[in-house]
Amino acid sequence: IVGGTNSSWGEWPWQVSLQVKLTAQRHLCGGSLIGHQWVLTAAHCFDGLPLQDVWRIYSGILNLSDITKDTPFSQIKEIIIHQNYKVSEGNHDIALIKLQAPLNYTEFQKPICLPSKGDTSTIYTNCWVTGWGFSKEKGEIQNILQKVNIPLVTNEECQKRYQDYKITQRMVCAGYKEGGKDACKGDSGGPLVCKHNGMWRLVGITSWGEGCARREQPGVYTKVAEYMDWILEKTQSSDGKAQMQSPA
């Protein structure tokens, strides 16, 4: 996160850290807890690393430096990448992770509510992006979970800024015209959440941007509302019943 500040314990209890353990262990992506056994993240996090066994999912944590060999983590039972995601393009950057064992909810580890299907009418004015990603383009992973308040940008405006790419209706953009605040490398897959009528909702999944926090280069996020049918289909077919935090 560029231009952010430290988060507090329990402030973003749905935020998870997706880490890979090969020879060393490192944080690669963020994710959002959406049910006892489900995490929503970006498909591109698994490019070149599709093996379930190498991943460790840490929930209910604030500081990555607090993680030791004794820190509990979740393992992956199944990675479900959107069927239309292609490595050669930036569309449908969404994936579900089914955990091997369900998580208990606590003050520091609980799910984020999902938006209504095709939610286009709600005007979100209080949106935040969180993650342990770089604090500048040529930076490094941060220890303490960062947060930043960023306004949404219309798709029309976003398309003007990204003429080389197709900004689809299944994407949502956020950023300041002057730059300075944005997601960055390592924040991929994490949440863009907006508070509406007193409730936090998962509006976007951190996907991509041209550099980080550059002027007139908003961040681009997968629009969760556009994938509600897919999310429900995959979680229900796997569970027999939905275990999601549906919107109030």
Epitope: G90, D164, A183, W208
Partner: antibody, heavy 125, light 108 residues
Amino acid sequence: EVQLLESGGGLVQPGGSLRLSCAASGFTFSHYLMTWVRQAPGKGLEWVSYISPSGGHTIYADSVKGRFTISRDNSKNTLYLQMNSLRAEDTAVYYCARVATGIVARSRTRYFDQWGQGTLVTVSS
Amino acid sequence: DIQMTQSPGTLSLSPGERATLSCRTSQFVNSNYLAWYQQTPGQAPRLLIYGASSRATGIPDRFSGTGYGTDFTLTISRLEPEDYGTYYCQQSSRTPWTFGQGTRVEIK
């Protein structure tokens, strides 16, 4: 299966014009940047031009700027290269290529993942 | 413009040998925008490596790419008969997009 098929090459006199076409199939053409690359006989590859998915943004190599025009018709899944004021040094095999723009670590990538078979343009009197 | 300088110009090696091809750039190139292509006579180029180190679909694991900034390398761990040809590095970090002049890998 992704396919790119160039056509329109041939022999043309210096100062003449030619229009190359590239018919695309097997993918959502309107989502991709497209590019032209050329290769003079016995020489290396030279990038010529690219066009954005909508067609609203185009960039050219200095060697062809003001003479060549790249365009596309997304309804026909076709890429074009209009070549005017041709010179002997424009003699080359012209390839159209798809520009993949995937996502790696929250940034986009760019690389030419699919190529046509090429069409030969010969500029000679 | 970003100049791409490949070395050596020609590499004469026997099957089974290791090939190391270098690509140096005149300015910093974001690794995401560095690719390697193979071309055999009479054929269109074929993508081998993108993002400096990711193998394209269907490319055998004897091909690997490394590098950062201005110094990139393509390695073929054990040359196979079908690997002979010309290899090009290319950047699309800044326009104009540019190719190296190529390294020809020939049978010794």
